[in-house]
Each structure stands twice: as structure tokens, then as C-alpha cells.
């Protein structure tokens, strides 16, 4: 689940089995000139960044939950 920082796709691989408990925030990067695919980068409670699979049903649930909690704050 390494995260690169150059102007290209940041997610070299994604983590399986992610759990929402330790996710502090989620950044969804839409496809663009730097990267042809949607990327989902979570920041964990310990500050570590983790790439998630945007096609995973549980990741979709997590994103939806985070967006909803942002709206209500």
C-alpha cells in the first residue's frame, strides 16, 4: 500500500481488509493527466497513509460514511 509523491499515480498497490476504525480522513483523487485511475488515500490514526481499492464495496461504504460525517460537521 505504498504511496508515491511524484506527479504520477500515487498508489502502487492497495490494502485488503481495511477497517474504518483507524481512518482519520480519506482523500479521493479523480483521474487526471497525472493518473488515469481514481485513487483513494486514507490517513490512519497513526499518520500513516494507505491506498484503498476504490472498487471495493467496503471502501465505497467508508468513503460514503466519511463524506456524510463531513457534511454533518
Amino acid at each position: 500500500a505504498s504511496v508515491a509523491t511524484e506527479l504520477r499515480c500515487q498508489c502502487l498497490q492497495t490494502l485488503q481488509g481495511i477497517h474504518p476504525k483507524n481512518i482519520q480522513s480519506v482523500n479521493v483523487k479523480s483521474p487526471g493527466p497525472h493518473c488515469a485511475q481514481t485513487e483513494v488515500i486514507a490517513t490512519l490514526k497513526n499518520g500513516r497513509k494507505a491506498c484503498l481499492n476504490p472498487a471495493s464495496p467496503i471502501v465505497k461504504k467508508i468513503i460514503e460514511k466519511m463524506l456524510n460525517s463531513d457534511k454533518s460537521n
Epitope: 500500500a1 490494502l15 481495511i18 477497517h19 483507524n22 497513526n46 461504504k61
Partner: antibody, heavy 119, light 107 residues
Framework: QVQLQQSGAELVRPGSSVKISCKAS????????MNWVKQRPGQGLEWIGQ????????NYNGKFKGKGTLTADKSSSTAYMQLNSLTSEDSAVYFC????????????WGQGTSVTVSS | DIQMTQSPSSLSASLGGKVTITCKAS??????IAWFQHKPGKGPRLVIH???ILQPGIPSRFSGVGSGRDYSFSIRNLEPEDIATYYC?????????FGGGTKLEIK
């Protein structure tokens, strides 16, 4: 490599308290939740609670609230569990277990600390 | 709290054979189930997490499947070192809860 070293067996009197320890090595202690699990003789596993050493955040199983108190010392990379007002029901083996950051699976466990409550 | 009903509580099988253990949750646990192997005098060992993901170093003889409330764990080509008690754990919702355990013996 990750290791969790627990303190030795304890024989304690009913009504007293005991504090058991779990010393972590091989990883950034502050960055991972530490769980505590109870196993009574001949019984299954029971989750007691967890502490996040980085900020002292805790989650407890309601059944153990008031019975166990979880603390952590970042300087020595050691997690502690204090058990109060001990009765024979508290005689058990207690395990500490690290919780992985992204998927919260308990991937490393201590060897267990036996607590016997007897007069 | 979520209850985890594990069965059977004990089972006996032949070397080289296959065993299956099941756990039923009292509500949907979104595949957040782990399976542990526990031998006397040691700490439990994580075998599988998130229903089917094998821990590094665990042989592929071990497997897990399931969704919703129903999950199972299998060991094929049983070996003597598989003798242990196996537990399921749900970690969808705090407090985390274990199944009652299955003691595996070899015939």
C-alpha cells in the same frame, strides 16, 4: 521483529489489586492499539479492552468497566492492565495483543500472564 | 454486543483429512472475522483475517469463506501440528467478540 513480553504469574488475595505488564519491541509502540484478552481455566477467550498509547485513548468491553484499567508508558514501550477488587472469577490467563493499524487484526500476541486469586 | 456462535465445540478428524468450523454472528459483520489457532501455554496465533486473507507464513491448507452473518473456516490435509483450539473473532463492532472455540483432535 515484533515481540510482546508479558510479566510473570501472580498469586493474589481476594479483594486486592494486581497490575500486569506487556513490554513491546520491534515496532513503533505509540502507533498501534494494544488489546487485552482474558481466558479462564478451561474456557474461551474474552476481549477486555484496548488502549492507543499515542494519545491514551481507550475502548472497554462494558463487562469489564470498573474491573480493569488500561494504561501505557510510551517511554518504556509498556502497556499495563490493573485489575481491582479481585475475586475467584478473575483467576485467568491474560494476554496482550497488538492490533494492526489498517485492518485492526490482532497480529502479535504476548505469551500470557496467569493470575490466581486465592486466600 | 454481537454474539458469535461457533460450532462444533470439539471435533476429531484423521491425519490428511479435512475439517470445517462455522461461526454465525448475531448480525451482519461485513466480513470482519478473524480465525485464531491457540495451543496450550502460548498466545493465540492469527491464521486468517477479513474472512479469507491468510496471514504470512500460514500454509494454504487453511482457508476461510463467508459473508453477512455466516462464516466458515477449513483445514485440509490435516497435520499433527494442527491440533489446537480454534476461535473466530468478529471485529466489525466494538466490543470485539470471540466464538466459544473448537477443540480439534486427531483420530
Amino acid at each position: 521483529q515484533v515481540q510482546l513480553q508479558q510479566s510473570g504469574a501472580e498469586l493474589v488475595r481476594p479483594g486486592s489489586s494486581v497490575k500486569i505488564s506487556c513490554k513491546a519491541s520491534g515496532y513503533a509502540f505509540s502507533d498501534y492499539w494494544m488489546n487485552w484478552v482474558k481466558q479462564r481455566p478451561g474456557q474461551g477467550l474474552e476481549w477486555i479492552g484496548q488502549i492507543y498509547p499515542g494519545d491514551g485513548d481507550t475502548n472497554y468491553n462494558g463487562k469489564f468497566k470498573g474491573k480493569g484499567t488500561l494504561t501505557a508508558d510510551k517511554s518504556s514501550s509498556t502497556a499495563y492492565m490493573q485489575l481491582n477488587s479481585l475475586t475467584s472469577e478473575d483467576s485467568a490467563v491474560y494476554f496482550c495483543a497488538r492490533e494492526r493499524d489498517y485492518d485492526v487484526a490482532m497480529d502479535y500476541w504476548g505469551q500470557g500472564t496467569s493470575v490466581t486469586v486465592s486466600s | 454486543d454481537i454474539q458469535m456462535t461457533q460450532s462444533p465445540s470439539s471435533l476429531s478428524a484423521s491425519l490428511g483429512g479435512k475439517v470445517t468450523i462455522t461461526c454465525k454472528a448475531s448480525q451482519d459483520i461485513n466480513k470482519y472475522i478473524a480465525w485464531f489457532q491457540h495451543k496450550p501455554g502460548k498466545g493465540p496465533r492469527l491464521v486468517i483475517h477479513y474472512t479469507s486473507i491468510l496471514q504470512p507464513g500460514i500454509p494454504s491448507r487453511f482457508s476461510g469463506v463467508g459473508s453477512g452473518r455466516d462464516y466458515s473456516f477449513s483445514i485440509r490435509n490435516l497435520e499433527p501440528e494442527d491440533i489446537a483450539t480454534y476461535y473466530c473473532l468478529q471485529y466489525d463492532n466494538l466490543p470485539w467478540t470471540f466464538g466459544g472455540g473448537t477443540k480439534l483432535e486427531i483420530k
